[in-house]
Interface confidence: medium
């Protein structure tokens, strides 16, 4: 009922002292090699001269950090990155970084990279609103700090600030055009 040599599993390493013979009921725990992570149970048990259990080591490393337009990587580059490793970006002048400066290898996937945007902070067209419109001709690009005003269609009442402003490449919250309550 004893078990002989330990079974081998890909990228898994048995822990503790190796023995020639293992008694029934004895357990051996495995750990994973670098870049790998245990998926499920990490033990095997000796039962009726056989080992039961199958430790599985999953590759959780990452390769090729995401490419970020108008940016370059400032941390050391590796052919393979272990889970938890971070990579830092820097924007080329005159671009400005929005988002996390670093990406991280998280169990085989990179976290979301930053964006390098034109630091002028321009805005696109103002957001459309139901039952209302802006009072000026819409442009495709607006300079930082520029404002537009909304007006509501007949019978609708404006709630909120009628003027919105372009800041940091984003428009402030537009107003709503509400139908007045009919009594």
């Amino acid at each position: 009922t004893d078990c002989l040599s330990l079974p081998s599993f890909e990228n898994a390493i048995p822990m503790g002292e190796k023995k020639d013979v293992y008694k029934a009921g004895e357990q051996v725990t495995y750990t994973c090699a670098t870049y790998y992570k245990m998926d499920g149970a990490s033990n095997v048990t000796c039962i009726n001269s056989r080992w039961t259990g199958r430790p599985t080591c999953r590759d959780t490393s990452c390769v090729n950090p995401p490419t970020v337009q108008n940016a370059y990587i400032v941390s050391r580059q590796m052919s393979k990155y272990p889970s938890g490793e971070r990579v830092r970006y820097q924007c080329r002048s005159p671009y400005e970084m929005f988002g996390d400066e670093e990406v991280m290898c998280l169990n085989g996937n990179w976290t979301e990279p930053p964006q390098c945007k034109d630091s002028t902070g321009k805005c696109g067209p103002p957001p459309p609103i139901d039952n209302g419109d802006i009072t000026s001709f819409p442009l495709s690009v607006y300079a930082p700090a520029s404002s537009v005003e909304y007006q509501c269609q007949n019978l609708y009442q404006l709630e909120g600030n009628k003027r919105i402003t372009c800041r940091n490449g984003q428009w402030s919250e537009p107003p709503k055009c509400l139908h007045p309550c009919v009594i």
Epitope: E96, M97, D100, E101, E102, M104, L106, T111, E112, P114
Partner: antibody, heavy 117, light 107 residues
């Protein structure tokens, strides 16, 4: 270990501004972004804005006209300022560290703010 | 902005039971994160990017989903799991939004 400690007033008069300081330890603000989130019984958890490690900011469109987030890396402090508070801004305000993928891993203890005269 | 609808609002379970709570997005999202919050405490990260357990989270928790439908599953509920669980999304050019929460109660 990583900690975010918040300090700020508990009571704010209507139409006044709210200022909260988030002092961090165990990590550097030059490496991590810090988010601001609030929690109210009526609206649940709401994202307000973030200051990234490089100092740039992103604000929720709903708050961009009255919110300002800044920081002092050398003092490990992030500053939150919201103007023109009204009764429905009554909430618990949290700062939280960016983990990556726009998730938050460590949170401050929260600042309970009541807007009332 | 993207609206996250969590169901059920309250989930009542017995210790040892398997439970699943869902989070549906009004349109497709890039990432879904989950947080656990107990009364009087700040939220704690629980699951990152759909399926990655945060540090210290027991292996009985798992997360799955894609597109507009995501779920958090507890294989065998324990008393310490009683809390409110919030989902949070991140989608390109959309603000971060949270679900209204699922409160897990133990019978």
């Amino acid at each position: 270990q990583v900690q975010l400690r918040q300090s700020g007033p508990g009571l704010v008069q209507p139409s006044q501004s709210l200022s909260i300081t988030c002092t961090v330890s165990g990590f550097s603000l030059t490496n991590y972004g810090v988010y601001w989130v609030r929690q109210s019984p009526g609206k649940g958890l709401e994202w307000l804005g973030v200051i990234w490690s490089g100092g740039t900011t992103d604000y929720s469109a709903a708050f961009i006209s009255r919110l300002s987030i800044s920081k002092d890396n050398s003092k490990s402090q992030v500053f939150f300022k919201m103007n023109s508070l009204q009764a429905d801004d009554t909430a618990i305000y949290y700062c939280a560290r960016n983990f990556g993928n726009y998730a938050m891993d460590y949170w401050g203890q929260g600042t309970s703010v009541t807007v009332s005269s | 902005q993207i609206v996250l609808s969590q169901s059920p609002t309250i989930l009542s379970a017995s210790p040892g039971e398997k439970v699943t709570m869902t989070c549906r997005a009004s349109s497709s999202v890039t990432y879904m994160h989950w947080y656990q919050q107990k009364p009087g405490s700040s939220p704690k990260p629980w699951i990152y990017a759909t399926s990655n357990l945060a540090s210290g989270v027991p292996a009985r928790f798992s997360g799955s989903g894609s597109g507009t439908s995501y779920s958090l599953t507890i294989s065998r509920v324990e008393a310490e799991d009683a809390a409110t669980y919030y989902c949070q999304q991140r989608s390109s050019s959309n603000p971060l939004t949270f679900g209204a929460g699922t409160k897990l109660e133990l019978k």
